[in-house]
């Protein structure tokens, strides 16, 4: 069953088909409402004054998932918990189409990096998606940022069109993904 999210609240202004977020920086552990406020402007469909979509307000729909580009800074673990609060997980990239969609979205913010749902305990153990599935480098390569000073970048973020490993404690933005079934 597919949940349909309807919203006609005035919490965000609908202008030229875009949600205009208030873009508040939130460096503390956010509440659910502040999480949903802290997102990039996203395209929405207007239907007779009420928005009808399988995604909540402020989320972008692509194929069978809803995506939230969170603009609150947090560690990888904190970002993971933010997504959980919203009933979702950090982004898992399943296909080249999905990767292309994500790259297109984040490339519009060249100053920002976004955590995705890939991590590992340490360099000797393979990368693992948050849901426990294996990572295949056939889809994309992870460019390392390891140095002598920071030898253990064990979480992954995307910056423009490149995917990097990074220290999990570094504050960054994030991408939440909520899969839906038709």
């Amino acid at each position: 069953t597919m949940a349909i999210w309807r919203s006609n609240s005035g919490s965000n202004t609908l202008e030229n088909g875009y949600f205009l977020s208030r873009n508040k920086e939130n460096h503390s552990q956010p509440t659910q409402s502040s999480l949903e406020d802290s997102v990039t402007p996203t395209k929405a469909v207007k239907t007779t004054g009420v928005l009808s979509s399988p995604c909540p307000p402020n989320w972008i729909i692509y194929e069978k998932s809803c995506y939230l580009f969170s603009m609150s800074l947090n560690s990888w673990d904190g970002s993971k918990r933010q997504c959980w609060q919203l009933g979702s997980n950090l982004l898992k990239i399943d296909s080249s189409n999905e990767l292309g969609f994500i790259v297109k979205q984040v490339s519009s913010q060249p100053d920002n990096s976004f955590w995705i749902g890939l991590s590992r305990p340490q360099t000797e153990v393979p990368w693992l998606w948050e849901d426990g599935s294996t990572f295949s480098s056939n889809l994309f390569q992870i460019r390392t940022t390891a140095t002598q000073e920071n030898p253990s970048p064990n979480c992954v973020w995307i910056h423009v069109s490149v995917i990097y490993d990074q220290l999990c404690s570094v504050p960054s933005y994030s991408i939440c993904e909520k899969k839906f079934s038709m």
């Epitope: 673990d77 305990p121 000797e124 153990v125 948050e130 849901d131 426990g132 599935s133 294996t134």
Partner: antibody, heavy 118, light 107 residues
């Protein structure tokens, strides 16, 4: 729903080999590591290793290196664990377990009792 | 190999009691720790992963905490079906290793 169904109990003589199967259903078999864990009677749990069903790559605990072989048949979504040169202290229940978040074991087979006795 | 120790090795408790089990790793494992419940003749069941994340379908009376070397599993109000053996498991480095178990039985 995710299900792991293992082959039946085996009785083996010391020095022989045993091959245990684990048939997976309810998810995409090639997407998740399959672990093997054993438990001797009245004892705790011991991780033996894993197989990546997608690539066939394996990672074995040092203790079992040279004696254990993990394989898979993706056409029938089945993982196998073969242990050779059996000793009496290999008597245990052998479990397959599907990987979950943070390298935990979220789904388990029902277990296969392997008895090694002369 | 990383050694995992658990305490106590066994505990007697009554229905409604709050029960706390501790697990200690011989070196830091960040939050790469899971907790399992096992009943006699059955396969283990995952309760907690990532040190504090509750597995789907597990009652909220179970909670996990800790990071680094010291971890805790708490059952806030013990139910009859909770009498079992509990194991911790580290997933920080190979080989993955389990604690020796803590048996929770009826007082």
């Amino acid at each position: 729903q995710v299900q792991l169904v293992q082959s039946g109990a085996e009785v083996k003589k010391p020095g022989a080999s045993v091959k245990v199967s684990c048939k997976a259903s309810g998810y995409t078999f090639t997407d998740y590591y399959m672990h093997w864990v054993r438990q001797a009677p009245g004892q705790g749990l011991e991780w033996m290793g894993w197989i990546n069903p997608n690539s066939g790559g394996t990672n074995y605990a040092q203790k079992f290196q040279g004696r254990v072989t993990m394989t898979r048949d993706t056409s029938i979504s089945t993982a196998y664990m073969e242990l050779s040169r059996l000793r009496s202290d290999d008597t245990a229940v052998y479990y397959c377990a599907r990987n979950s978040g943070s390298y935990s074991f979220g789904y388990w087979g029902q277990g296969t009792l392997v008895t090694v006795s002369s | 190999d990383i050694q995992m120790t658990q305490s106590p090795s066994s505990v007697s408790a009554s229905v409604g009691d709050r029960v706390t089990i501790t697990c200690r790793a011989s070196q830091g494992i960040s939050s790469w720790l899971a907790w399992y419940q096992q009943k006699p003749g059955k396969a283990p069941k995952l309760l907690i992963f990532g040190a504090s994340s509750l597995q789907s379908g597990v009652p909220s009376r179970f909670s996990g905490s800790g990071s680094g070397t010291d971890f805790t599993l708490t059952v806030s109000s013990l139910q009859p079906e909770d009498f079992a053996t509990y194991y911790c498991q580290q997933a920080y480095s190979f080989p993955f290793t389990f604690g020796p178990g803590t048996k929770v039985d009826i007082e």
